[in-house]
């Protein structure tokens, strides 16, 4: 069973979200379940470290982008939100919170500010930002 859910605060347009847990889940209450991932958008502005701590306190992590297919709903996200991607200044690599390397061809990383953290924006773009700057954030939890 699918229901058209319009989440005005997060998405640019109507997004199809399955309602029954047999299709997806389980997820924490009021989180979005989509293709075996749970997502939640947090409207309060925090710096990257505080955002990370907030997600961790809910047994989740900041958004990790790993698949354009499985995470195609992210194309529709509007505005800018902290994700779990960080720049390692010593060697210039881009890594997720869990230490895994950003896969090529997933994100276009755009220099908005000098910094070592990244904001997610629609169409698989990441914007470099100072980690201390307050922003809204997206938490993610894998269901499998």
């Amino acid at each position: 069973i699918w229901s058209a859910v319009f989440l005005n605060s997060l998405f640019n347009q109507e997004v199809q979200i399955p309602l029954t847990e047999s299709y997806c889940g389980p997820c924490p209450k009021n989180w979005i379940c989509y293709k075996n991932n749970c997502y939640q958008f947090f409207d309060e502005s925090k710096n990257w470290y505080e955002s990370q701590a907030s997600c961790m306190s809910q047994n989740a992590s900041l958004l990790k982008v790993y698949s354009k297919e499985d995470q195609d709903l992210l194309k529709l996200v509007k505005s800018y939100h902290w994700m779990g991607l960080v720049h390692i200044p010593t060697n210039g690599s881009w890594q997720w919170e869990d230490g895994s390397i950003l896969s090529p061809n997933l994100l276009t990383i755009i220099e908005m500010q000098k910094g070592d953290c990244a904001l997610y924006a629609s169409s698989f773009k990441g914007y470099i930002e100072n980690c201390s700057t307050p922003n809204t954030y997206i938490c993610m939890q894998r269901t499998v």
Epitope: G92, L102, I110, E111
Partner: antibody
């Protein structure tokens, strides 16, 4: 058509300086990271330096650190490499190369300029 | 620094042959690998990026595979214009590093 044209190479004595330039056209220069890669005569490719689109991130090979300076002028669509304290082992063809269209995460180089030869000899 | 080791350093082959070149990274680089072709007196040309993605305009006889530390460039049916030197390069971190090159020569 995307084009990169290097200039500024030549013969210089050890300890001397040179400034290489790379003129870019056919793409939005300010959106791409840019790189210098060199190739000594008869040898393989050696990455020299990279600069991100807004010059926020700059990296150098250990072999040139402290002697070479990469810079860019987005208004002029130009990339530069200031080379000081040149050594015989810096003798090479120097190529200017654009980063892949992935912004700051660009990992490879395309396209490349035709190269400019730098010869360091007394 | 990540070391890139290419093998063989040279290979003699005939037109129509299948040629395989391998590249090994000293540590895991996910799929951050590119392959270039260089002909004498010319600038290198990007063939494959992200380990297996074919660059626009490159013939489909070129293919790349691998992930982590071990990668392969394959030319399915060697053509006269393919005789050149091939380089791999890791793009995950700085310093960017290249393999030593593989020269594909006419047998």
């Amino acid at each position: 058509e995307v084009q990169l044209v290097e200039s500024g190479g030549g013969l210089v004595k050890p300890g001397g300086s040179l400034r290489l330039s790379c003129a870019a056209s056919g793409f939005t220069f300010s959106s791409y990271s840019m790189n210098w890669v060199r190739q000594a005569p008869g040898k393989g490719l050696e990455w020299v330096s990279s600069i991100s689109s807004s010059s926020s991130y700059i990296y150098y090979a250990d072999s040139v650190k402290g002697r070479f300076t990469i810079s860019r002028d987005n208004a002029k669509n130009s990339l530069y490499l200031q080379m000081n304290s040149l050594r015989a082992e810096d003798t090479a063809v120097y190529y200017c190369a654009r980063g892949a269209p992935m912004g700051a995460a660009a990992g490879w180089f395309d396209p490349w300029g035709q190269g400019t030869l730098v010869t360091v000899s007394s | 620094d990540i070391q890139m080791t290419q093998s063989p350093s040279s290979v003699s082959a005939s037109v129509g042959d299948r040629v395989t070149i391998t590249c090994r990274a000293s540590q895991g680089i996910s799929s951050w690998l590119a392959w270039y072709q260089q002909k004498p007196g010319k600038a290198p040309k990007l063939l494959i990026y992200a380990a297996s993605s074919l660059q626009s305009g490159v013939p489909s006889r070129f293919s790349g595979s691998g992930s982590g530390t071990d990668f392969t460039l394959t030319i399915s049916s060697l053509q006269p214009e393919d005789f050149a030197t091939y380089y791999c390069q890791q793009g995950v971190s700085f310093p960017r590093t290249f393999g030593g090159g593989t020269k594909v020569e006419i047998k």
